[in-house]
Each structure stands twice: as C-alpha cells, then as structure tokens.
Amino acid sequence: SERCDDWGLDTMRQIQVFEDEPARIKCPLFEHFLKFNYSTAHSAGLTLIWYWTRQDRDLEEPINFRLPENRISKEKDVLWFRPTLLNDTGNYTCMLRNTTYCSKVAFPLEVVQKDSCFNSPMKLPVHKLYIEYGIQRITCPNVDGYFPSSVKPTITWYMGCYKIQNFNNVIPEGMNLSFLIALISNNGNYTCVVTYPENGRTFHLTRTLTVKVVGSPKNAVPPVIHSPNDHVVYEKEPGEELLIPCTVYFSFLMDSRNEVWWTIDGKKPDDITIDVTINESISHSRTEDETRTQILSIKKVTSEDLKRSYVCHARSAKGEVAKAAKVKQKVPAPRYTVELACGFGAT
C-alpha cells in the first residue's frame, strides 16, 4: 500500500462512553490535524474510511456497518453507535484518502459501565460555582447532535442515587440545573439523564459532572501576607540557622496564577552567592482559597547576611504585595567577669 500520513494514536482524545447508550464520535483528523473540514475533503473527492482494533488485539479490521438496526453507522465525519456495547472498546482509526492522498489517525474508545448511582471509571468534568453568588446554572454537557431540535427529550437530574426533586436551593430546569445560592453543601457529583425517542426506540444519554463551590469574586482580595509581619523580629547570632516563613493567603480567582517569591537585597535568591534554600507548601480551604508558605532558610548565617534586606513578594490577578522581614543580629550577652563586674562598681 502507498504511503499514508499516519498521525499515530491520539491519546489526548481518550474517549469514554457509557455502555448501552448512543455515542457520536467525530473523526479527529478534521478537528486537530488537517487544515480543512470534511465538506471540503468530500467535495475534493476524498473518502473517509473507518476501521478498528479490538481491545487486546493487534489485528486491524473493518467496522461492520451491517449490524441489525444499523447499530454502528457513519454519517459524514461522525461514527455513530446506537447504542454502544461493552466489547466496542478498542482503538478506532479514521483514514481520509483518494488515489494520491492519504492521512489517518487512531484514537482509543473505552465503553464503560455505570452503576445505579452513576458511579463509573469515567473521568468527570469539574464545574466551579461561586459561593453565595446568586443564581448560577450548570448545563447537561455533550448532548448536541444526538437528536433534532424538533425532538423534545425528557431530562432528569440526580445527585448520586437520588433524583433532584425538591432540594432546598437546586432547581432542575430542563437541560439546566439552577443553584439559587450555591453553598459548600452543593459540592458533589450531578448527573443528567436525557431520554429521547428515535425510530421507535428510546435512548438514554447519561452525563455526570462534579460541582465544586469556590470563593466568590465578590469577596476576592489582593494577596494577604500574614508572615513576615511587624510583630516578629528574626534575631540571630552568626552561625545560627535563619528560617523566615513567608505565608500568603490568596482568594480563589478563576484562572489566576498565584505567585510567591523572596528577594534578598532586591535580587532573586538564585542570583546571589549565599547558600539559601527555599521550601514551598500549599494548602487550600474548602472554597479553594489558597495559602502558600515559602520558608527561606540559611543554614549558617553570617553577620553580613543579617544586614541584608529579606522581602517576601506575592502576586495574583488581584494585585501584587510585598513585605520585608525584620532581621537583626542578636546583641551578645554580656561577659560576666568584665561587664557585670564593672556594672557593680568593682575596680
């Protein structure tokens, strides 16, 4: 066979679908690899061919499009399962070709089982809701293209095993689930089951997502440096270890990059010759506010080091702040024989 541009196995598209449900899978060539769409390819005389390799097999085989009730079919650049079976799991390849051109890509498809409470190995998308922010909605995801707009499906929403009917602050509204005022108690997995008719059969689409209630932008503040502060003085003798924590609180901000760093005499620790180590730890509150601690450590501090300026800096999308640590050399305790004796008036 002549050469074909093989894009290999596209593991970025690990497609998971539920057993015994319809699935529509677009050929990834047109979405990620080629600069033209299916319509252009088709009008240029290119043909889209599908085949697959079963799980735990090496043999590529054509897809059987002659199954009863057209269980597997192809429509333009979409491969349809109506519905899937567990043993449809495998690597699927779509190949676009004519006599002079060939391009193909493979992708893994995993058909997974769910239990009566919608638990499964499916990776769940996370939807973040702001705490106490007024009405917010989540929408039943990835159901476009399964049925025409003339078909009116029934949608049922669940939290775990339980149909949402009269929750205090959660209202099912068709494809949307409305949270009147999101609270921490609303954290969890929510499932929509979309039921629609097609050619005398009834199909179900199950979609589960995780809701995580996070800090509201209404309450967001610039970073707050708790340490160093004006109340603590780091007083050391030369030769001792100097440890200064920089502890910063960051309000949750969607897509914000939180940064903490130290400067010593205005320079980054990497840019100076002294032997400094910095260890960072991060913790999160239930609403994903973040506390970062960077501990600056000098194992054996010198009198020169104790004269330097140590400044903790923090930055988020809300602003930038800095705070200097109060570092000083400990005054040595008086030597009894001389200083104290003089103090008592001895001659």
Partner: antibody
C-alpha cells in the same frame, strides 16, 4: 463509625399521630439519605420514604403519601418520621437506615437503627 | 412498582448443608439487587449488594448471583448463626422494593 439510635416504644390510639426520632452519631460530612422502613409483626419490610437532611429533599412511598412526614434537624443530626391518622394496621417496628453517602449504589441501607415499636390500640 | 417474589417461603436445612434462596423481579433490575439477613428482635443487616458483592464483614460462605430478573443467594455451609429470615431488595427503580422474605430454619 456511624450509628443510628432511635427513640423508644410508643403506644398510640387510633386516629392519633406518632413521631419517631433517629439520631446519627459519628456522621461524616458527606451528604447522605435517611430511609424509613417499617415491619408489621410477622411481616416483611416496607419502604416508607427518605430524607436527604443536608438538602431537605424528601420522597415518600405512594402508600404513605399524605399521612407521613419526614423531617430532619441538621444541627442535631436527627431525622424524624411522623405518621398521622394511625390505625391498628400501622402497628409495626419502624426502622431508620442510611448509607455513608448519596453515591453508594446498593448500600443506602447499610446502617440501621435498632427499631421503634409503635403499637396502635384503643 | 417492581414486585419482588422470594421462594421458598420457608427453607428447612441442616447445619453444614448448602442453602439456596431465590428472588425474582417482575421486570429487569439489572444487577441492582441487595440481600439482607434479619434475626428475631434485630434490625436487618446488609449481606450482598450489586447482586454479588459481599458487604463489609460478611463471611465468604454467603454468595449472590444473577442479573435481570432471576437472583440467587447461596449459603455454602450453614452455621447456627445463619438461621434467620432473608430479604431481597431491588434498587433499580423507585420505589425501592423488598421481597416478602425466606425463613431459613433448622431441619
């Protein structure tokens, strides 16, 4: 370890109401549901309804609709089942039961209370 | 609602023997079936869920099988503490429903 402790036995007159309590101890923070099930003397188990205390959602078996009210007090981790217009055939042991979370398929009746005998007699 | 029918109503077995209890659903409940054990004066105890998964702390002599409408609970070698009433329950469709029970008594 989660435990459910129910209120003591009750003797009631026909036409009156009874309110049985079920207190959860050692509760995890996860939301859960409390189920109510009854068992008449020498008979099988009959599901009556449930409540999800954290969300206030209740659902009742058709048979008890209009006569049963399930409530919960989150602050004391206590659920209540009130049955009104009692008749002699309501004489039964009333159980509360729960799972660890809302997500445990098949384990929503994992932990049971000790049962409360309600006798309806004139 | 789904009706669960258990058979036999009473099963007489000698200690050490195998006991096989049946449960039939009026329509398919997939594998969404649980078994409970109840001793006199006690609350029921979950034995099996998902038709075949033993609950925490349940001895290996208890096993469940079946799917759809036909289910079986097997006690491989009856111990004295196993004489009790056993209930099946479906949790595939609301309302969740119990069978009427099978009493396992000493022969």
């Amino acid at each position: 370890q989660v435990q459910l402790v129910q209120s003591g036995a009750e003797v009631k007159k026909p036409g009156s109401s009874v309110k049985v309590s079920c207190k959860a101890s050692g509760s995890p923070a996860e939301p859960y549901a409390i189920q109510w099930v009854r068992q008449a003397p020498g008979q099988g188990l009959e599901w009556m309804g449930y409540i999800i205390p954290l969300h206030g959602q209740v659902d009742y078996a058709q048979k008890f609709q209009g006569r049963v009210t399930i409530t919960a007090d989150e602050s004391t981790s206590t659920a209540y089942m009130e049955l009104s217009s009692l008749r002699s055939e309501d004489t039964a042991v009333y159980y509360c039961a729960r799972g660890q979370t809302l997500y445990d398929s098949g384990r929503q009746f994992d932990i049971w209370g000790q049962g409360t005998l309600v006798t309806v007699s004139s | 609602e789904i009706v669960m029918t258990q058979s036999p109503a009473t099963l007489s077995v000698s200690p050490g023997e195998r006991a096989t209890l049946s449960c039939r659903a009026s329509q398919s409940v997939s594998s969404n079936l649980a078994w409970y054990q109840q001793k006199p004066g006690q609350a029921p105890r979950l034995l099996i869920y998902g038709a075949s998964t033993r609950a925490t702390g349940i001895p290996a002599r208890f096993s469940g099988s079946g799917s759809g409408t036909e289910f079986t609970l097997t006690i491989s070698s009856l111990q004295s503490e196993d004489f009790a009433v056993y209930y099946c329950q479906q949790y595939n469709n609301w309302p969740w429903t119990f069978g009427q029970g099978t009493k396992v008594e000493i022969k």
